[in-house]
Amino acid sequence: MDSFNYTTPDYGHYDDKDTLDLNTPVDKTSNTLRVPDILALVIFAVVFLVGVLGNALVVWVTAFEAKRTINAIWFLNLAVADFLSCLALPILFTSIVQHHHWPFGGAACSILPSLILLNMYASILLLATISADRFLLVFKPIWCQNFRGAGLAWIACAVAWGLALLLTIPSFLYRVVREEYFPPKVLCGVDYSHDKRRERAVAIVRLVLGFLWPLLTLTICYTFILLRTWSRRATRSTKTLKVVVAVVASFFIFWLPYQVTGIMMSFLEPSSPTFLLLKKLDSLCVSFAYINCCINPIIYVVAGQGFQGRLRKSLPSLLRNVLTEESVVRESKSFTRSTVDTMAQKTQAV
């Protein structure tokens, strides 16, 4: 082979604000976080603090009641789903602080960001189960008296969790770490390797099963429940219904941006300006969805204060009052301290 000095003319001026440029040294890259990322970090911090403490408290309160109170079983499972998701937040927080660098490895990349989707599916399936329960209490009170028990409630929860895990698998499988050449950075994200159809399919399934179908069915469900409740002019407390409606509403509100951006990105080219804009908002949308993981304990406390007039009781007893209300006089053949209604009123209980 010929041996000669290979030289190339040096560069003139470059006005390219680039991180990988022909004349940009390695250490000359930007260290400022984008505004959406800063907002996401603030939300993550708040959600983590409120979510871990709030859901831990809900778990503690409802765990003791779950053997005999069906409402406690529902709220316990919701709290566990939220608590689990909150555990991933310190890692997600750290990654955003490091400009989305992911030093935690491939396994963590597959598992931790998938927890919020597991939470989404678990939450909506549990909310659907709770809503079905509320519906049956209103429209099939005799059936509820005979068959509505803790055992059946736990089976329903187990089915919800199983389905949630199944629905999370696609997102889990397509999550990969991508190592960028310059600046040296490892990114954790989804990779459908060219297959836009598969990416769209996953996004559509997520939108339909995790948002649109539940939104439609739960809206119909609560319309019927509320109509029946108002027509009967129920005199007993409707606090569980109010709490459940608030939880359901918050679910859809906080998941909306994530779902909208997700479906849009699946139909856009990765190099298109709209895609790149939405990608910048991704962390913010995820953090907004994460508010679901801390909002329930807040709803319970607000509801408790509303029902109590003002916060006279300790937080655990206030939560216990909201979360373990009996919907049918004899649940699991036992009375609880919150059962004060007469048999005549019980059929109107929602």
Epitope: V26, D191, S271, L276
Partner: antibody, heavy 116, light 112 residues
Amino acid sequence: QVQLQQSGPELVKPGDSVKMSCKVSGYTFTDYYIDWVKQSHGKSLEWIGYFYPNNGGAKYNQKFKSKAALTVDKSSTTAYMELHSLTFEDSAVYYCTRGSGPFAYWGQGTLVTVSA
Amino acid sequence: DVVMTQTPLSLPVSLGDQASISCRSSQSLVHSSENTYLHWYLQKPGQSPKLLIYKVSNRFSGVPDRFSGSGSGTDFTLKISRVEAEDLGVYFCSQSTLVPVTFGAGTKLELK
């Protein structure tokens, strides 16, 4: 003017090691990666890895992790690549190039021939 | 690893013809900085590769304007508007978005 001057051709026996050099001039040595690329006869280019002189960090292509060792001598602005346990498949031209971006500046290449 | 698929492997042309080389990557080359690090090199016999186009469409200094690059995401093209004798050689596409940096198999531009 950016220049990368590589050491001359090497004829080695299977199982031996070889160390080639790449003398850099014309820019701040510690500001950019030094990347190494392999080209077997009549074949495409394969990226071996880079060495970042500023912090001593190296990144290897998984394929070459146990084959190549990258080092630098900052005082002489020279990069080195040592190839271990050579086999006939290691016979190729090895280029050094300035990295941290598209490979705009290349050395002339070092031909390594592995022969019994 | 990102696989770079170049077509055609051989491109016979006459001087003055237009030439087009395609390069497809196995995954998106959009970097987190929003840039796409897809480059084109020309290697003549017995020489080192030389940079022609960087970041999809930017001509390197000294490269004639008959060379142009285009594309986005995973599909890229190098065009030579009027082939000259000095353009003959092997053209490689390469990505430096992800580790490891990878190259296409090469397209040999030769006279008919």
